[in-house]
Amino acid sequence: CKAMHVAQPAVVLASSRGIASFVCEYASPGKATEVRVTVLRQADSQVTEVCAATYMMGNELTFLDDSICTGTSSGNQVNLTIQGLRAMDTGLYICKVELMYPPPYYLGIGNGTQIYVIDPEPCPDSDF
């Protein structure tokens, strides 16, 4: 296992619709053809996996159908979008990148992106 540098923004504010996008960029030491990207959430010292996708270079990222993540790739950059976020989902979202094939295997973990989420103000009741 060899180390690899991964960069991501330090802090992002999600939209009022609970959507946060950020770029995860990795310094690929070689010509990887198969890459795995995992988003981890760290909150109160606990780390949980949010979503993961494996993709072939030049192809789209494919997350599971029920995943809250979507993404696109371009060269050594992965543009990740996490949706359905609520205030309670505020936390540090860490990008983990693995170069799966061809060998050697490389692993890189970013410092994380602190995502802040605000629950939208409830709409005032309207009389009809």
Epitope: V11, V12, L13, A43
Partner: antibody, heavy 120, light 108 residues
């Protein structure tokens, strides 16, 4: 070195608007947030809101909602805070501060402050 | 909104004495998101402690922070003349971010 440099002091009449700038240097501007904090004479620190320089999304303190607008110009690494319908109790020193987000979760770099005086 | 309270409002001590400042949050705050700032007259605040207990770059070892949950403490082990100032705690665990009202440390 990493620093935030703010625009100069302003004197405004009640009902007017003020726009304070905060120019960042020495770091990747879009990777961090910019918070605005004000301090009335002899008072404590009041958080006004913040902007995510990465995507331009904003969050404002409830008491200022509708009167304040925070923006960024990523081409010049500058953040702006505009406050409208000024009142005498808006007289304060206005600070911008960098929100780190990851390792320190704090306002690690502060501007020098901009004195805004509202007086008729 | 998380309300931060600080005590005492004023602390009158002599140089060389130990200062203990308290900060309480109205609801639990992850210690990673609790910071302390020092402010001297006519100056911008300066980050002292982040993550409840980690000293910021260039901050002397006489400053230390501790605590978790709702109760946090800033300790200055031996007050130096330049330490007489106002100290604020602040949380950025939840929006809106909030500051405590401050504790003024003045010379006895």
């Amino acid at each position: 070195q990493v620093q935030l440099v703010q625009s100069g002091a302003e004197v405004k009449k009640p009902g007017a608007s003020v726009k304070v700038s905060c120019k960042a240097s020495g770091y990747t501007f879009t990777s961090y947030g910019i918070s605005w904090v004000r301090q009335a004479p002899g008072q404590g620190l009041e958080w006004m809101g913040w902007i995510s320089a990465y995507n331009g999304n904003t969050n404002y303190a409830q008491k200022l909602q509708g009167r304040v607008t925070m923006t960024t110009d990523t081409s010049t690494s500058t953040a702006y805070m505009e406050l409208r319908s000024l009142r005498s109790d808006d007289t304060a020193v206005y600070y911008c501060a960098r929100l780190t987000g990851t390792t320190s979760h704090a306002f690690d770099i502060w501007g020098q402050g901009t004195m805004v005086t509202v007086s008729s | 909104e998380i309300v931060m309270t600080q005590s005492p409002a004023t602390l009158s001590l002599s140089p060389g004495e130990r200062a203990t400042l308290s900060c309480r949050a109205s609801q639990s705050v992850s210690s990673s998101y609790l910071s302390w700032y020092q402010q001297k007259p006519g100056q911008a605040p300066r980050l002292l402690i982040y993550g409840a207990s980690t000293r910021a770059t260039g901050i002397p070892a006489r400053f230390s922070g501790s605590g978790s949950g709702t109760d946090f403490t800033l300790t200055i082990s031996s007050l130096q003349p330049e330490d007489f100032a106002v100290y604020y705690c602040q949380q950025d665990y939840n929006l809106p971010f909030t500051f405590g009202p401050g504790t003024k440390v003045d010379i006895k």
